[in-house]
């Protein structure tokens, strides 16, 4: 059916399939050192890994994409690992009137799926 | 800033960057011929193409990902081309009580971005 259950066990071996991974990044890495004061370093959760057939399918479209990729790999790309949700992050940054806190809702991934 | 404007012109040449493409698929291709009656064939819009630095960035996370991929390509993958929105689709399918229409909201892509 259009709502086949997405597969949750990785057939490629541990750590190979789409998952959340932490990447350390400094303000310099991000190019933010001129306007962000704090934190000096961010633990950035990102989505990495492969998306084998029906693994963590985001939705019906992803299931179709996986199937058609199997039939026409040159024409249809495999689904890829992207955030399914985000963790809000607070940054302390410079403004014209001083410093202020601002929340960013789409900065750090909280979960991943194959889309 | 965290909200740098995503780039909209493709530096790789026409048709190479993330865009919407139509793929024809039959019910047999999709494995749906046992439960869907109509349509016999679907024009499936899918997201294909590459995501060069800051091209059609979905959000701040995608911009960070693009930047860190430039710094640590082995550790951080490039953003990839996925649907930003969907076109609802109706399918006519068999049920125990007869045939009926059902709308699927996440079946055909309407727009794409790099996430």
């Amino acid at each position: 059916s259009a709502h086949a259950h997405p597969r949750d066990s990785c057939p490629l071996g541990p750590g190979r399939c789409c998952h959340l991974e932490t990447v350390q990044a400094t303000l310099e890495d991000l190019g933010w050192s001129d306007w962000v004061l704090s934190p000096r370093q961010l633990q950035l959760s990102m989505c990495v890994g492969e998306c084998p057939h029906l693994y963590r399918s985001a939705n019906t479209h992803a299931q179709i994409k996986a199937r058609l990729h199997g039939l026409q790999p040159d024409k249809v790309p495999a689904p890829c690992c992207v955030p399914s949700s985000y963790t809000p992050v607070v940054l302390m940054h410079r403004t014209d009137s001083g410093v202020s806190l601002q929340t960013y809702d789409d900065l750090v991934a909280r979960g991943c799926h194959c889309a | 800033s965290a909200h740098a404007h995503p780039r909209d012109s493709c530096p790789l040449g026409p048709g190479r960057c993330c865009h919407l493409e139509t793929v024809q698929a039959t019910l047999e291709d999709l494995g749906w011929s046992d439960w869907v009656l109509s349509p016999r064939q679907l024009q499936l819009s899918m997201c294909v193409g590459e995501c060069p630095h800051l091209y059609r960035s979905a959000n701040t996370h995608a911009q960070i990902k693009a930047r860190l991929h430039g710094l640590q390509p082995d550790k951080v993958p490039a953003p990839c081309c996925v649907p930003s929105s969907y076109t609802p689709v109706v399918l006519m399918h068999r049920t125990d009580s007869g045939v009926s229409l059902q709308t699927y909201d996440d079946l055909v892509a309407r727009g794409c971005h790099c996430a």
């Epitope: - | 009656l37 109509s38 349509p39 016999r40 024009q43 076109t87 609802p88 689709v89 109706v90 399918l91 006519m92 045939v99 229409l101 709308t103 079946l107 055909v108």
Partner: antibody, heavy 118, light 112 residues
Framework: QVTLKESGPGILQPSQTLSLTCSFS??????????VGWIRQPSGKGLEWLAH???????YYNTALKSRLTISKDTSNNQVFLKIASVDTADTATYYC??????????WGQGTTLTVSS | DIVMTQAAFSNPVTLGTSASISCRSS???????????LYWYLQKPGQSPQLLIY???NLVSGVPDRFSSSGSGTDFTLRISRVEAEDVGVYYC?????????FGAGTKLELK
Amino acid sequence: QVTLKESGPGILQPSQTLSLTCSFSGFSLSTYGIGVGWIRQPSGKGLEWLAHIWWNDNKYYNTALKSRLTISKDTSNNQVFLKIASVDTADTATYYCARLAYDYVDSWGQGTTLTVSS
Amino acid sequence: DIVMTQAAFSNPVTLGTSASISCRSSKSLLHSNGITYLYWYLQKPGQSPQLLIYQMSNLVSGVPDRFSSSGSGTDFTLRISRVEAEDVGVYYCAQNLELPPTFGAGTKLELK
């Protein structure tokens, strides 16, 4: 719940243009596979397919009447329109609009009656 | 255009007994994909038509299973296994193999 409702002038004189409106709810004409068609039925007689319009703006007109018909849609306001130029007494009928999904015509309006009389 | 032919009236039927309504098309409605593009509608007195049967043999959800349909490429039959008072009306067959979709003239189901 899907509902469709036709509206029209009721009475016209020969050679005038008939303008019909189908107002619908419960579905969207921006959904892939959905269309709206117009069908008419002279009193006590059978059904005749006039025209239909799809979600992607593709249109079909009955060949026998094509030169007189114009179908259009206003997706955001859930309306479909049909114009029939230079009506004649033979156009006296009940006009129905109906929802299409591919080849499935599942929901019809209650119909609006047109009388063409001089 | 494909012509759909129906008798104007059915044989009068008694409530609780079965009824059959026939329809013939001027061209086979069986497509190369295996689907027969034949439909049955019922128009009850003072109402708009309602779809009963989809693609020759598929009952539409919500329609009582007293209704069934069968046929070849050109000859079709709608059967009502136990006729009820609410089944009275005009039954139309229609084709959607080719544009324009065309309807039969309708068969009026009459009770004894």
